[in-house]
Structures are given as C-alpha cells and as structure tokens.
Interface confidence: low
C-alpha cells in the first residue's frame, strides 16, 4: 500500500507494525461495527423470541433494507470494484435511517446502538475518500427518510421489536458482504 | 508547504455569534477533512467536529451540535466555523486542524483563534 | 464518550532524564490513539500516531506503545525544548477525545 503524504516508512517507531492502510483502517472499522451489532443482536433476542420468528415476512414487506445483489458488482462472479463501491456506500447512507431508528430501541445497550450509528458515519467517510466516483453517490431524501422514521416509530411493539431485528440482521449481512468485497479491493 | 491561516482574535457580547475562517494551502483542500477543535485557558483539547470540504458533510461532537456550524469554501480553500447564542464559557482558543491521510488524527493545525465573550 | 485519563499532570525533571506519561481509556480503541506536544504559546504538533508510529519528521527519543485501553508515551532522554505540554487523543469512535494534559517542566 502506499506511504501516505507527509510520511516516509522508515519513520514508524515499531518496525512490525507500520501505520494502518485505508483498507485495513476500513477493515478494522466495519469489525468494529459488527462487534457492536453482536451486541445488539443479544439484547434484542434475550428480550423476545423475535430471533427465532417464523413470521419476519411480514415486516419486511414494510421495510427497504438495502441488499447485495448480482448486478452490484460485489460478489465475486461479475466483479467490479467501482460499482461495488458505490453500492457499499449507497447502502451504507441508506441504512443510516433505519440506526436512527435503533437508538431508542435498547435499554442495556443505549451507548452500543450509539456507537454503531456513530461508527458508520466515520466508515462512510473513509469509504467515501477511497471512492473515486463520488458524484454516482445518491443521497437518500431527508425528507423521505423523517417520513420513513415516523412510519416506524408508529409501529405497534410487535412490529418495533421485528423491525428492530431485521434492521441488524440486514446491516449485519451487508457489512458481511461489504467486507470480502472491500478485501478483493 | 502545509498551512492553515487562521482569522483574528474576536471579542463578542454574550448573546452573539461569531464567524471565524481558516484558509489552507500548500495542499489540496477538498482532499482532506478539517477538524475544529476547542481549548480553554489553561485547560485540554475539547474536539467540536469536523468537516469534509469536499462534500460539506459535517459531524460534531455532541456537545457543540447547537453551538457550531461548520462550511467549506472550496473556491477560496477556506474552512468557516460559526458559534451563536455565546457565553463566557464559549471564551477560548479555537484551531483548525487537517484530518492525517489515514485517520482521524490532526497532523498540521493552525495558530489559533482567541475568542473572548464579555460584556 | 470515551474518556481518556491522562497521569500524571505535571512532571518536573531534569535533561537527560526518562519520562513516562500514562493515558487510560475508559474502554477499548483498539490502538487509534494520538500523542500531541504543545509548546508555550504555540499549536498542538503531532507527535504519534496509530499507538506506536512516529509522525514524520519527529525524534527518536520520542516513542508510543499500548494495549488496547493503556497507553504509555515515551521521552527517552529529555531535553530542553521538550519544555511542553503532551495531549493523548482517541480517534477510535467519536467524539474524538483528549486526555487532560500532562505539563512537562525541566529543572
């Protein structure tokens, strides 16, 4: 990987470890958000039988959760690097709505649901300084996302707690998605 | 080389904003996201947010959500930070600091605001 | 926020002593941890980065290390423009936060 601007390789104080690359700083960063989502997931199951739910077709019908698909160039038959990276950013702007919609969802793990959301701000950006193509970057609406959130909040418990399970379990897979991807780059 | 020129001391009324700007050179401006970043006489480093000049996407600490807005001039290469509603509390120095390539860090900062809110 | 415990907050020595400055974060950040001197009167400068890595053009004598929540920084033989005052940061989750400070007198 190249030596960043303003740094020489030879200026690292510990030989065995030199500074963290973009991809490894990016790497490291979505690890982090599934560490948190980990936990997440454990308050959300112990607290209801949402986990093991047969019926979370239901509540996905109302839902838009962003999801990999062939055409986005992330998989490794038909892939392409740009595309896939403009979808992982995408995705990742797109799923920022439904992390609003979690930071009110959790009693032991507040600070948790807080970090998780925070922490995707911060892998947007460095994604978004590894993005070449910034201008194919479509911004979801803020309106139609605060219209999205008081649809969601208006749920009744039942549909809060699967809408709060699908939100990880979806965010969980792109993330897992998004970091093989982001390892062939 | 690397330089961030920041505006001149300020003496503000409780009450009032000020607008304070922080003009790079010596790199490419909308390359590198610029942090804010707060210290009081005598006390530590208080981190108010940052922005991406490029984008004009910013994100706060939030503590200064309500305090701080910040905007990127590209044309000029000048990052802006404004405060409103300030108190005694809000008297301080305030630097501007480029984000280093591979991280959050604060790699060239500049010589410092002084902000002084009295009546 | 993480909160970063910075020990001690002064520290007088002498040229050619050993110093050790102590930053403790009240959970783990892995190792995106930042080292900052301060002269009197003058802007932070970054000194380390990542834990351990030496911003470029800084002296040896300088060194970081840690473990994922204890942080030690280095001065291996002080002298005398290392008169300053030596900030830790976090940047592992925002708000990036900064250790209170530990001023750094010579005899």
């Known amino acids: 990987a190249p030596v960043p601007p303003g740094e020489d390789s030879k200026d690292v104080a510990a030989p065995h470890r030199q500074p963290l690359t973009s991809s490894e700083r990016i790497d490291k960063q979505i690890r982090y958000i599934l560490d948190g989502i980990s936990a997440l997931r454990k308050e959300t199951c112990n607290k209801s039988n949402m986990c093991e739910s047969s019926k979370e077709a239901l509540a996905e019908n109302n839902l838009n959760l962003p999801k990999m698909a062939e055409k986005d160039g992330c998989f490794q038959s038909g892939f392409n690097e740009e595309t896939c990276l403009v979808k992982i950013i995408t995705g990742l702007l797109e799923f920022e709505v439904y992390l609003e919609y979690l930071q009110n969802r959790f009693e032991s793990s507040e600070e948790q649901a807080r970090a998780v959301q925070m922490s995707t701000k911060v892998l947007i950006q460095f994604l978004q300084k590894k993005a070449k193509n910034l201008d194919a970057i479509t911004t979801p609406d803020p309106t139609t996302n605060a219209s999205l959130l008081t649809k969601l909040q208006a749920q009744n418990q039942w549909l809060q707690d699967m809408t709060t399970h699908l939100i990880l379990r979806s965010f969980k897979e792109f993330l897992q998605s998004s970091l093989r991807a982001l390892r062939q780059m | 080389q690397v330089q961030l020129q920041q505006s001149g001391a300020e003496l503000a009324k409780p009450g009032a904003s000020v607008k304070m700007s922080c003009k790079a050179s010596?790199?490419?401006?909308?390359?590198?996201?610029m942090h804010w970043i707060k210290q009081r006489p005598g006390q530590g480093l208080e981190w108010i947010g940052y922005?991406?000049?490029?984008?004009?996407?910013?994100e706060f600490n939030q503590k200064f959500n309500d305090k701080a807005t910040l905007t990127a001039d590209r044309s000029s290469s000048t990052a802006y930070m404004q405060l409103n509603s300030l108190t005694s509390e809000d008297s301080a120095v305030y630097y501007c600091?480029?984000?280093?390539?591979?991280?959050?860090?604060?790699?060239?900062w500049g010589q410092g605001t002084t902000l002084t809110v009295s009546s | 926020s993480i909160v970063m415990t910075q020990t001690p907050k002064f520290l007088l020595v002498s040229a050619g002593d050993r110093v050790t400055i102590t930053c403790k974060a009240s959970q783990s950040v892995s190792y995106d941890v930042a080292w900052y001197q301060q002269k009197p009167g003058q802007s932070p400068k970054l000194l380390i980065y990542?834990?351990?890595n030496r911003y470029s053009g800084v002296p040896d004598r300088f060194t970081g290390s840690g473990n994922g929540t204890d942080f030690t920084f280095t001065i291996s033989t002080v002298q005398a423009e290392d008169l300053a005052v030596y900030f830790c940061?976090?940047?592992?989750?925002?708000?990036?936060?900064f250790g209170g400070g530990t001023k750094l007198e010579i005899k």
């Open positions: 990542y834990e351990s």
């Open positions: 922005i991406n000049p490029s984008t004009g996407y910013s």
């Open positions: 600091a480029r984000d280093a390539y591979y991280g959050n860090y604060e790699d060239y």
């Open positions: 940061q976090q940047v592992y989750t925002s708000p990036y936060t």
């Open positions: 010596g790199y490419t401006f909308t390359t590198y996201w």
